[in-house]
Structure formats: C-alpha cells, structure tokens
C-alpha cells in the first residue's frame, strides 16, 4: 500500500495505490483511491508511467481527456467514471501486455489540493491448476495442468499424509510454449500415489502462487483450486 501526500500552495490530499499484477492478454486494474471533491468537474485524474512520454490516461471535467495519451495505451484505458466522485481513480487496462510492467503514478488534483502515489505493476501469466487422476498411466498417477504461466514457475507437490516429504524424485514437470510464444502450459505428473490422501500441486512464480488440491478416496475424488497474487502492497 502506497500512500502519497501532495504538496502545493493548497492543501495536500491523500492518494493511495496498491501494487498489483496483470495477466497478459486479459484486462487488469491499477488501483488508486483518493480524498474526493464534492463536484466531479473539480477532479482531475492523471495516470503516468515511468519512461513513457505521453500520459497513460487523463480524466478531467467529468470526462476522459485523451489528447496527450501515449500511443501504447491508445484505446486500452478507462476509469470508473461513476465512481470518481466517491474517490475511485482506479484504471482499467485492457489486453495487458508484458511491456505494461513498470512504475505508474496516480496523480490527483482537486479544489482542495494535489496528491500522488506510485504503483508497481507486474505483468505475467498465471492460471488455476487442475489436478486429475491419470487413468492412462500404468500406476496410480496424478496429473496437474495449468494452461498459462509466465515467467516460468516452479512446481512443488505436497501431501497431507506425508507432510514435509520431497516428491521431486517421483514427479515430472514439463513446460510447453503456447502459440503466442510467451506463455507456457505447465504439466506436472506425480507417480506412486496412495488413496485416502490429499495431494497439492503448487505452482509459483514472482507474480502469483496457485494451488490445486485433490483428495482421492475409494469412493470419491474431491478437487479444490486457489490462486493468490503475490506482492500486493498498498502505497
């Protein structure tokens, strides 16, 4: 969480951002909140990116003002116009690219004063893993698949019964490049699985951590998945 205070002839206003991550090819949100003004037309929102000459986005007098917008963001940005009056300056970024990563500044001007806060935006790919029993294998085998990851993640298996056990010797992980030549499909196979146990396939890179659980008993199979973005720090 980054909290910035503006310094100007007028009062400073509090602006708060949260470091976040974007999933390439999908839409992302750069979070920013501020101390709002009573009148929408008195609020100016500017989003800037370090190393980029033009603006990422500008909202003023109640509408988008995109004449100074940098080419790389053309047609890809929007603020939540109906929530600006309640202090939401968050930016929606469409079709996140790897090159969108970097340091952004949320800069606010109101009749009370000015304020800004920086935001670290990471980009990559992350997806939920699915763990299934591989009935084609000769022995009891689990197969963990996640369609899109970047950068290349690590994969670790764990089990509820054998806590702390190292499964690297009885597992095999492969990374297959997807058609867009950036993201990769992750496939990990775990051998010699015993029933009445819960196994977890944990996939992690510097952006996200995802876990796929499977509980195998004689009568049923239960699955659960969970994905968590890392380093979501507020400023």
């Amino acid at each position: 969480l980054i909290i910035g205070f503006g310094i100007s002839g007028r009062h400073s206003i509090t602006v708060t951002t949260v470091a976040s991550a974007g999933n390439i090819g999908e839409d992302g949100i750069l979070s920013c909140t501020f101390e709002p003004d009573i009148k929408l037309s008195d609020i100016v929102i500017q989003w800037l990116k370090e190393g980029v000459l033009g603006l990422v986005h500008e909202f003023k007098e109640g509408k988008d003002e995109l004449s100074e917008q940098d080419e790389m963001f053309r047609g890809r940005t929007a603020v939540f116009a109906d929530q600006v009056i309640v202090g939401n300056a968050s930016l929606r970024l469409k079709n996140v690219q790897l090159t969108d990563a970097g340091t952004y500044k949320c800069y606010i001007i109101t009749s009370k004063g000015k304020g800004n806060a920086n935001l670290e935006y990471k980009t990559g790919a992350f997806s939920m893993p699915e763990v299934n029993v591989d009935y084609n294998a000769s022995s009891e085998t689990l197969r963990c698949e996640a369609p899109r990851w970047f950068p290349q993640p690590t994969v670790v298996w764990a089990s509820q019964v054998d806590q702390g056990a190292n499964f690297s010797e009885v597992s095999n992980t492969s990374f297959e490049l997807n058609s867009e030549n950036v993201t990769m499909k992750v496939v990990s196979v775990l051998y010699n699985v015993t029933i009445n146990n819960t196994y977890s396939c944990m996939i992690e890179n510097d952006i996200a951590k995802a876990t796929g659980d499977i509980k195998v008993t004689e009568s049923e199979i239960k699955r659960r998945s969970h994905l968590q973005l890392l380093n979501s720090k507020a400023s």
């Epitope: 909140t33 709002p36 003004d37 009573i38 009148k39 929408l40 037309s41 007098e61 109640g62 116009a81 109906d82 929530q83 600006v84 009056i85 309640v86 202090g87 939401n88 009749s111």
Partner: antibody, heavy 122, light 113 residues
C-alpha cells in the same frame, strides 16, 4: 421501494461509545453513498459524512473526524456508524440518508431513515 | 464552511395563500463549469424525517407537488409554495452541496393559521 431502517433509541453514559445501524432495502446497496446526518435542537442539521459500500471509501466532516466511524456490511445491506467518547453535546437524533444517483455529485439526500435518538446522560 | 441563512425563521399563513421563504449562502453556489446551483430544499413534517423537495435549486424531486417551486441563483434562493395546504405544515431547510462539508440553513417553520 427504497427503505432505510434505523436501529432503536440509545441511552448511553458520557465517555462511552454507541454503534447505530441503518439497514437498506429496495435498491442496489453497493451503488449509492450512505450519509449520516445529526439533528440536535441547538445545532440544527449537520452532515457527519458518507460511506460508499461498493468500495468502503468514506468521507467525513472535519468536525466529526475521530468521533464518528462508518462501516458497511454488504452481505446484510447495512451501514453502521460508531460514535465514540460521547458527551452531552452528542445527544441528538441521527439519520441515515441515501445519496443521489447522479455521477457528478453524491448529493442531495433522496431517501432518509426514520432517525435514531441518542441520549447521553450520566 | 459555507454558511446558509434562512428567513424568516417562522411564518404563519392561511390555507390557499402563497408563501415565499428565503435562503442565502455566504458564497456563490453557481458552478460556472456546468451552470448549476448546488442547492437543495428539504421539508420536515413534525415527528418525521426530512424529505427532498428541490435540487439543483429549481429541479423538483419526483412525486413533489407542483405547488412547490425553487428559484434563485448564486447566493440568493427562494422556495415558493403557490397555494398552501394544511399538510404543508413543516420546517423547510435549504442545503448547499457546492463544497465540503455540505451545510444546512437553520430552517423556516411554516405554521397554518
């Protein structure tokens, strides 16, 4: 139809705290600001602040900062206001009121609750 | 803070009469950007909650009888009731929402003779 149901009257001792509630129905709770207004014989109507349940963002009148704290529970469509370190000056009727549906301002107040009487007395 | 002054503090009229009450602000409530006056009028009947009558100084809230009219601009505003009915017995408040914190006038109490 839009309804704002406030909690019942409170008799509290000086220095204590009180938490008032306002349950909303008949509209999308997370899409509108909820305001609290104080009405006392000596001071008339005074705006305390608002909360936007969609994000939890709040805005307070400087006069009530540190004394009033607003929260919202989306699951029950209820807004709360806690008043702390109460004195006899806080004896008043407190109203919750829903903000308007314009995107250019969160005012005026289009719907009001029935009010909660708070009496601060030893 | 913007100070709102209402006059008279009370008045008594007969049913059918025309009534005007005044509200003055310590600074202009007209916003040049959109030419709107950030002023509202509320009616509070005895033992009840306030109800919105007028916003943007002259826009009647849905369901409000057309005998209620708001007028004025800048710092001087008026609420007019063209033909008073017995049910109009109430206190009328003006409120500015031009700058934080929004503030109310002390009210005008309308009594029926």
């Amino acid at each position: 139809q839009v309804q704002l149901q406030e909690s019942g009257p409170e008799l509290v001792k000086p220095g204590a705290s009180v938490k008032l509630s306002c349950k909303a129905s008949g509209y999308s709770f997370t899409d509108y600001t909820m305001h609290w207004v104080k009405q006392s014989p000596g001071q008339g109507l005074e705006w305390i602040g608002w909360i936007y349940p969609g994000s939890g963002n709040t805005m307070y009148n400087d006069k009530f900062k540190g004394e009033a704290t607003m929260t919202a529970d989306k699951s029950s469509s209820t807004t709360y206001m806690q008043l702390s370190s109460l004195t006899s000056e806080d004896s008043a009727v407190y109203f919750c009121a829903r903000g308007g549906d314009s995107i250019i301002t969160v005012f005026p107040f289009t719907y009001w609750g029935q009010g909660t009487l708070v009496t601060v007395s030893a | 803070d913007i100070v709102m002054s209402q006059s008279p503090s009370s008045l008594a009229v007969s049913v059918g009469e025309k009534v005007t009450m005044s509200c003055k602000s310590s600074q202009s409530l007209l916003y040049s950007s959109n030419q709107k006056n950030y002023l509202a009028w509320y009616q509070q009947k005895p033992g009840q909650s306030p109800e919105l009558l007028i916003y943007w100084a002259s826009t009647r809230e849905s369901g409000v009888p057309d005998r209620f009219t708001g007028s004025g601009s800048g710092t001087d505003f008026t609420l007019t009731i063209s033909s008073v009915k017995a049910e109009d017995l109430a206190v009328y408040y003006c409120q500015q929402y031009y700058s934080y914190p929004p503030t109310f006038g002390a009210g005008t109490k309308l009594e029926i003779k």
